[in-house]
Interface confidence: low
């Protein structure tokens, strides 16, 4: 709030801009007829130092010269980089109640001379772009510093443009606004940057370049792909490029991929044949360009072209499995199952499957197409049957996969031994086995098959299976494995014309069942009691039930109950006990046990045997 220095003046020696570490002398002088009174000796001049509008020091003790009542000179040292404000005030000593009156002020800037600009780099984006250069300015000067960019080329032509740096903006890039055209391709250009401020000036080393050095081509545009004869693996990528481009880099990848396929193409002229594409796959394509084989810079990548390759006929072999069920003495039901091809094998949208069942000797053939991944037929029990399935898309069909229909569990000598199922974690089970001991024929492969042991699972849900080579004796099953569910697991050993199997139950995680079995009836037959029950509902089993326990005790007894443990079998829902006394009333109940523990007890039933005691 200095009122245009009406009372006096403030001057700085050597200058209001000084190098870091220098001292300055600040003189404050009153104008004639200005002051406190007619007694000059009562005029006291003081100097206040402000940084960022905050008073930081009264320089009363730094006076180096004093003309009493008229002027004072103060020496200031150790000024920090940047701007410092000094304000001179008049303090009338005979009037203590009045505050000092501002006389005038001055700003002193402390900084450094500019360093020579370094690392000059120039680019022209596209053949029709303009030249823009950037550089490293070096240390901050803390002063307003002007930069001049100067370009000299052929025909004695020089152009220049300026910008400045201060505490609000930085100047380390300039667009000259001129275009270097391809007809100047062989010419050399020299560029330099000069920096000037109040403390000095400096100039960069000259930087020499040619058109090819600095022109970064525009990214290719109008990218499209033409699939030759609607091929899914071969296509011609086409694009538009600037006229001088001699080298292109292509990158492409399926959309779900994490690594690019890279190709360099010389003199492609906006066209390149790709031969290794995956049919029926969403791809992303990008192209970059360069104007010179050895020198110059690559353009930015083009915008992505995203497109899907056409279909091709499926490849690969379907994984087939089957179930056999005898219907009566001369008919059997064959249910064929197969797994969908993975996308790289399907190579398109699978429209249907061609299924064939053939009786080898009589040459009877049943054929059908289905859109499902299973097929069921009733066929005679006699004869040797073989099945084949192939997958078809709009371009053709895969080679048929054949499987011989044998009695899967018909040959005891082929049954694998010591089958075990161990839970590995929440969603898989490790199945291990030993090979059949006395197989008549060599095992061609093992099939591990599993199905949730829930009501109707055989009819409602297809089986899950894994094919295992004959020299492997273990399988980690994980497909559709959920915790707290019991699975029936079968290991089949298959030879050319026979099959043997062993079965086990397993779960990936278990808890004690939620409830015990419900006793539905107690009947007395031939001096034995038969306990009948209903199984625990499937969701409450919480894993594979290992056994049931039947407990009993006399009605009012406080003694520990007796118990009978029964190996769990799905088909069994009654069991005899024979150690109860006649004409004694007993209380009976049941529990179920998994590997995790025992369930709470089921319902209690009272019963008084009438028969003779054992």
């Amino acid at each position: 709030n200095i009122d245009v220095c009406k009372l006096g003046t403030v001057t700085v020696q050597p200058a209001p801009v000084i190098p870091l570490g220098s001292a300055a002398n600040i003189s404050c002088s009153l104008n004639p007829k200005q002051g406190c009174s007619h007694y000059p000796s009562s005029n006291e001049l003081i100097l206040l130092k402000f940084v960022n509008d905050v008073l930081v020091e009264n320089l009363h003790g730094k006076k180096v010269h004093d003309h009493t009542g008229h002027s004072s000179t103060f020496q200031v040292t150790n000024l920090s980089l940047g701007m410092t404000l000094f304000v001179c005030k008049l303090n009338c000593s005979n009037s203590q109640k009045k505050p000092p009156v501002p006389v005038c002020g001055v700003e002193i800037s402390v900084g450094v001379a500019p360093e020579p600009p370094q690392n000059i780099s120039c680019v022209q984006e596209g053949e029709n772009g303009t030249v823009a250069c950037s550089w490293n300015s070096g240390k901050v000067t803390y002063l307003k510093t002007n930069y001049t960019l100067q370009l000299s080329g052929p025909n004695n032509l020089t152009c220049q443009k300026q910008c400045f740096s201060d505490n609000r903006q930085n100047c380390n890039r300039l667009d000259l606004g001129i275009n270097l055209s391809p007809d100047l391709a062989e010419s050399r250009f020299i560029v330099r940057v000069t920096a000037i401020n109040d403390l000095g000036n400096s100039s960069s080393l000259p930087h020499t370049f040619t058109f090819l050095d600095i022109v970064i081509p525009l990214p290719p545009w109008d990218i499209r792909i033409n699939f030759l004869n609607a091929s899914g693996s071969r296509g011609t990528l086409q694009w538009e490029d600037e006229g001088q481009v001699v080298l292109n880099q292509l990158r492409y990848q399926p959309l779900n991929s994490t690594s690019w396929n890279m190709v360099n193409a010389t003199n492609a002229k906006g066209k390149y044949d790709l031969r290794d594409l995956r049919p029926f796959t969403e791809y992303e394509f990008q192209i970059s360009s360069k104007l010179h084989l050895s020198g110059g810079s690559w353009s930015n990548w083009s915008e992505s072209l995203r497109t899907r390759t056409p279909e091709e006929e499926p490849v690969g072999i379907l994984d087939i499995w089957y179930m056999k069920q005898d219907i009566d003495y001369d008919r059997q039901q064959i249910s064929l199952f197969w797994k969908s091809l993975n996308p790289s094998e399907a190579r398109g949208k699978i429209l249907h499957y061609q299924v064939t069942l053939q009786e080898v000797t009589k040459k009877t053939t049943l054929q059908n197409t289905t859109r499902h991944t299973s097929w069921t037929r009733v066929i005679p029990r006699t004869g040797a049957w073989t099945a084949s399935v192939s997958a078809a898309n709009s371009k053709g069909a895969s080679a048929p996969t054949h499987i011989n229909i044998v009695d899967l569990c018909g040959t005891g000598l082929l049954a694998p031994h010591q089958v075990s199922a161990k839970s590995e974690n929440m969603d898989n089970i490790l199945v291990t086995w030993q090979p059949p001991k006395k197989a008549d024929s060599a095992v061609r492969e093992y099939i591990v098959e599993w199905r949730a042991l829930q009501p109707g699972s055989i009819t409602k849900f297809p089986p899950h299976w894994l094919r295992i080579p004959p020299d492997n004796m273990s399988a980690l099953i994980s497909e559709n494995i959920k915790p707290y569910i019991c699975y029936e697991i079968r290991v089949h050993a298959l030879s050319e014309s026979q099959g043997g199997c062993s079965s086990i139950r397993g779960d990936s995680k278990h808890k004690a069942p939620v409830s015990g079995p419900h006793i539905t009836a107690i009947t007395e037959k031939k001096e034995r009691l038969f306990i009948s029950w209903t199984h625990i509902p499937f969701p409450e089993q919480r894993g594979c039930i290992l056994h049931y326990r039947i407990y009993w005790k006399e009605r009012d007894s406080t003694a520990q109950p007796e118990l009978c443990e029964i190996q769990y079998r799905r088909s069994q829902n009654s069991h005899p006990i024979s150690s109860l006394q006649p004409r004694v009333t007993y209380v009976l109940w049941m529990t179920a046990v998994t590997a995790a523990g025992e369930s709470p007890q089921g319902n209690e039933r009272e019963f008084c045997p009438q028969g003779k005691a054992n």
């Epitope: 545009w221 109008d222 990218i223 499209r224 792909i225 033409n226 699939f227 609607a230 969403e282 072209l305 995203r306 497109t307 899907r308 056409p310």
Partner: nanobody, 129 residues
């Protein structure tokens, strides 16, 4: 021999609707770019709407018709349609069906007449006020 045959044009009152059809014969264009262009008397043929032919079959429209025109096709029938609603007098023109023998994704190329290899004879649409 490849033929594109437009139909469905006619005289309609402003605010009315039309459904133009383009039936292709002699070649399957289901995977390739197709478009509708129009030409009013004394003006150049201009792009109206197009289908890219790439996976997902992207539709393109000129801003002047966006929201009123809908382009679609049935690959199995080798037919393309242009549903025109809320017709205006400035929609009066001969409407041409065009087909390419390649996929086109870039907006600029879809609009270009040179992108398309085959053209129909056109169907007249007249909108009276």
């Amino acid at each position: 021999q490849v033929q594109l045959q437009e139909s469905g044009g006619g005289l309609v009152q402003a605010g009315g609707s039309l459904r133009l059809s383009c039936a292709a014969s002699g070649r399957t264009f289901s995977n390739y770019a197709m478009a509708w262009f129009r030409q009013a008397p004394g003006t150049e043929r201009e792009f109206v709407a197009g289908l890219s032919g790439s996976g997902g079959d992207t539709a393109f429209y000129d801003n002047s018709v966006m929201g009123r025109f809908t382009i679609s096709r049935d690959s199995a029938k080798n037919t393309m349609w242009l549903q025109i609603n809320n017709l205006k007098p400035e929609d009066t023109a001969v409407y041409y069906c065009a087909a390419a023998t390649h996929v086109v994704v870039n907006y600029g190329l879809v609009r270009r007449r040179g992108t398309y290899d085959y053209w129909g004879q056109g169907t007249q649409v007249t909108v009276s006020s």
